[in-house]
């Protein structure tokens, strides 16, 4: 007789003891049920301490089950930030590696003299890539300024060209535009494509801060009650072999997971922005196009510099005065053989498509993550029954469970008949981490259409706090440059998760 | 007006690292490259380095390759010089300069700190 | 590395003489050169750079000249402050090198 055999506790005994907690608590046979808090109040093989014992666990194999969802999601957004990463630094340096391979024979002393300030330019757009608070306008402004200092005093030993003249011819530069369209394309593709790159990497970043985040969220004491009652009151209760209703283990989870649940809204529009700025790294003004070919603009401007440099003299002299010549001085520089270089549209490579294909094709996997939650978790952890019959553990026995599934979200739990969710209190942290995936969104919109959202007066009406964590050494606070120290808003998000490789040693 | 402040003096046994430090105002710190020239007592100057504030790049004359590591802090707008492994001839004093414009030329100088090294 | 070499090492000279001291590369460095003076216990102080522009402050008593490997730095008409230490420098390239230094004494 199957009630009788219930009433001996040997199944309870062998489900407690698994986990590892001590026999000497499990009563031989059914107890009064009185002292339940948690579980219904009939005859019961749980004493308090056992009841105590099963409701910790089962939060704990919650909050389990719900790092484990997270992990995997962070490991697939990581690991996107990664493939990403590594192509669009190994597209920069590249585009270095040729420059320092080349330029020496194409250019001689006009690139060896001026070395360190091509090899500063590359730092440059690899901090900025990185998430540094530099301006990139003007970081490509003041390459160009040095360099046609520099170049200016190589291409004319012959004259004396002390600071203020430099000044003058400072000043005059850009309405002589020595070095033809090189810079003002540069600055055009340049600003786009990296900031295309930087912010679709970043939004990786930040998705993947917001889940690690959000995973850390605790469940709070309702929802350990509601988890209790779902996992090990069948047990308590004699019943071991009922598994949860459907529908009941999504309510309880549902109620849970509330707060969770908001992110949905502002999760989605931070996957849809990203898949759409991949459209930006295709093209002539695309990431791979522009990134990789650095170099190709430098050149350029050098032989328009070198070609135009009797017309841009006469006009420095026009605007500047008559430098005085150096008695000792060599004449004048020889014109070089303009400098020949690899075209200037990179051939893709098929390496970004294939990561583009496979990053959309998983960011849409994970689109609906926070309120398929509940029902995965359910079906994944909860050992539920196949179907709502009446034979599945309703929380008070066997039998069909009734109530209606809850919607999504906290203000749909008002009448969750399995948790007590209190909705006019939203938690702080998710509230923080919606408003993290606010402000990515927005910056990835403002880079969708070429601009840097963090040098626009843009007041992101976020507090500071939550994830703004992944600034990577001084790099969020500095600015750079030599004519302005214009203050800036720092960046709220850097590259999280990816080391810093500045400083290197040269010699 | 620029400005380069440097550490105070300091006393060091052979064997131990000293960490100077060099603290600039009165101009953009990340546009100008900075550099450290030591002067042995009665002796010539030599350049031991360079760094670059913005990026944190750097480029070190080889003899203190394997020994010295410059950085920055650009919250601070200072810039430090650590040798490493002192031995009684790293007795000089540490000057920091900074470049006139982006070529090379130190038109401004920190007071210098006197590094002794003795056992 | 770029050696440079400096001569005299020490000179004496009276207030209104006129004084040059000689720097020569071990190549050609164009004109990029640089002169210091420095007096006991102070810092060195920029006098000339690019081989022959004076640096802002400085007295017009001091001029440079030179280029490729062979630089001069005169002074007109020498003061009694101008007592010190001269180096040359090359700012070519790293890494950056000096003479060893020309001391002006006056008598």
């Known amino acids: 007789d199957p009630a009788s055999k219930s009433r001996s506790c040997g199944e309870v005994r062998q489900i407690y003891g698994a986990k590892g907690f001590s026999l000497s608590d499990v009563p031989q046979a059914e107890i009064s049920g009185e002292h339940l808090r948690i579980c219904p109040q009939g005859y019961t093989c749980c004493t308090s301490e056992m009841e105590e014992n099963l409701a910790n666990r089962s939060h704990a194999e919650l909050e389990t089950a719900l790092r484990d969802s997270s992990r995997v999601l962070q490991a697939m957004l990581a690991t996107q930030l990664r493939s990403f990463d590594d192509h669009f630094q190994h597209l920069l340096n590249d585009s270095e590696r040729t420059l320092q391979a080349t330029f020496p024979g194409a250019f001689g002393e006009l690139y060896t003299q001026n070395a360190r300030a091509f090899r500063d330019l590359y730092s440059e757009l690899r901090l900025y890539y990185r998430g540094a608070n530099l301006h990139l306008e003007e970081t490509l402004a003041e390459f160009w300024a040095r360099l046609l200092e520099r170049l200016f005093k190589q291409l004319h030993p012959q004259l004396l060209l002390p600071d203020d003249y430099l000044d003058c011819l400072g000043k005059q530069a850009e309405a002589l535009r020595p070095f033809g369209e090189a810079p003002r394309e540069l600055r055009l593709r340049a600003t786009r494509a990296f900031v295309a790159a930087r912010s679709f990497v970043q939004g990786l970043g930040v998705a993947s801060d917001v889940v690690r985040k959000v995973a850390q969220v605790p469940l709070g004491p309702e929802c350990s009650r509601a988890v209790m009652k779902l996992v090990y009151c069948a047990h308590c209760l004699g019943v071991p072999g009922a598994r949860p209703c459907p529908d009941y283990c999504r309510n309880v989870l549902k109620g849970c997971l509330a707060n969770q649940a908001d992110l949905d809204a502002e999760w989605r529009n931070l996957l849809d922005s990203m898949v759409l700025i991949t459209d930006k790294f295709w093209g002539t003004s695309g990431v791979e196009s522009v990134i990789g070919s650095v170099h190709t603009w430098l050149a350029e401007a050098i032989n328009a510099l070198q070609d135009n440099r009797d017309t841009l003299t006469a006009k420095v002299i026009q605007g500047c005065g008559n430098p005085k010549v150096n008695p000792q001085g060599p004449g004048p520089e020889e014109k070089r053989r303009r400098g020949k270089l690899a075209p200037r549209e990179r051939p893709p490579s098929g390496t970004l498509e294939k990561l583009v294909s496979e990053a959309k094709a998983q960011l849409r996997d994970v689109q609906d993550f926070w309120i398929s939650l509940p029902g995965t978790l359910c079906s994944e952890k909860m050992a539920l029954s196949t179907a709502s019959d009446d034979r599945c553990w309703n929380g008070m026995a066997r039998g069909r469970y009734l109530p209606e599934v809850m919607g999504d979200g906290l203000a749909n739990q008002i009448n969750n008949p399995e948790v007590e969710v209190d909705i006019t209190k939203p938690d702080m942290t998710i509230r923080q981490q919606i408003m993290q995936l606010k402000i990515m969104t927005n910056r990835l919109r403002s880079a969708y259409n070429g601009n840097d959202v963090d040098f626009q007066d843009a007041s992101d009406d976020g507090s500071g706090s939550g994830s703004g964590d992944g600034c990577l050494d001084d790099l969020c606070s500095r600015k750079v440059s030599r004519k302005s120290s214009s203050s800036r808003t720092p960046l709220t998000h850097a590259l999280p998760g990816l080391s810093e490789q500045e400083g290197q040693k040269t010699s | 007006q620029v400005q380069l402040v440097q550490s105070g003096a300091e006393v060091k046994k052979p064997g131990a690292s000293v960490k100077v430090s060099c603290k600039a105002s009165g101009y953009t710190f990340t546009g100008y490259y900075m550099h450290w020239v030591r002067q042995a007592p009665g002796q010539g100057l030599e350049w031991m380095g360079e760094i670059n504030p913005s990026t944190g790049d750097t480029t070190y004359n080889q003899k203190f390759k394997a020994r010295v590591t410059m950085t920055r802090d650009t919250s601070t707008s200072t810039v430090y010089m650590e040798l490493s492994s002192l031995r009684s001839e790293d007795t000089a004093v540490y000057y920091c300069a900074r470049e006139k414009r982006d070529d090379g030329v130190f038109a401004y100088w920190g007071q210098g700190t006197l590094v002794t090294v003795s056992s | 590395d770029i050696v440079m070499t400096q001569s005299p090492s020490s000179l004496s000279a009276s207030v209104g003489d006129r004084v040059t001291i000689t720097c020569r590369a071990s190549q050609g460095i164009r004109s990029a050169l640089a002169w210091y003076q420095q007096k006991p216990g102070k810092a060195p102080k920029l006098l000339i750079y690019?081989?022959?522009n004076l640096q802002s402050g400085v007295p017009s008593r001091f001029s440079g000249s030179g280029s490729g490997t062979d630089f001069t730095l005169t002074i007109s008409d020498v003061q009694a402050e101008d007592f010190g230490t001269y180096y040359c420098q090359q700012s070519f390239g790293p890494p950056r090198t000096f003479g060893q230094g020309t001391r002006l004494e006056i008598k």
């Open positions: 690019d081989a022959s």
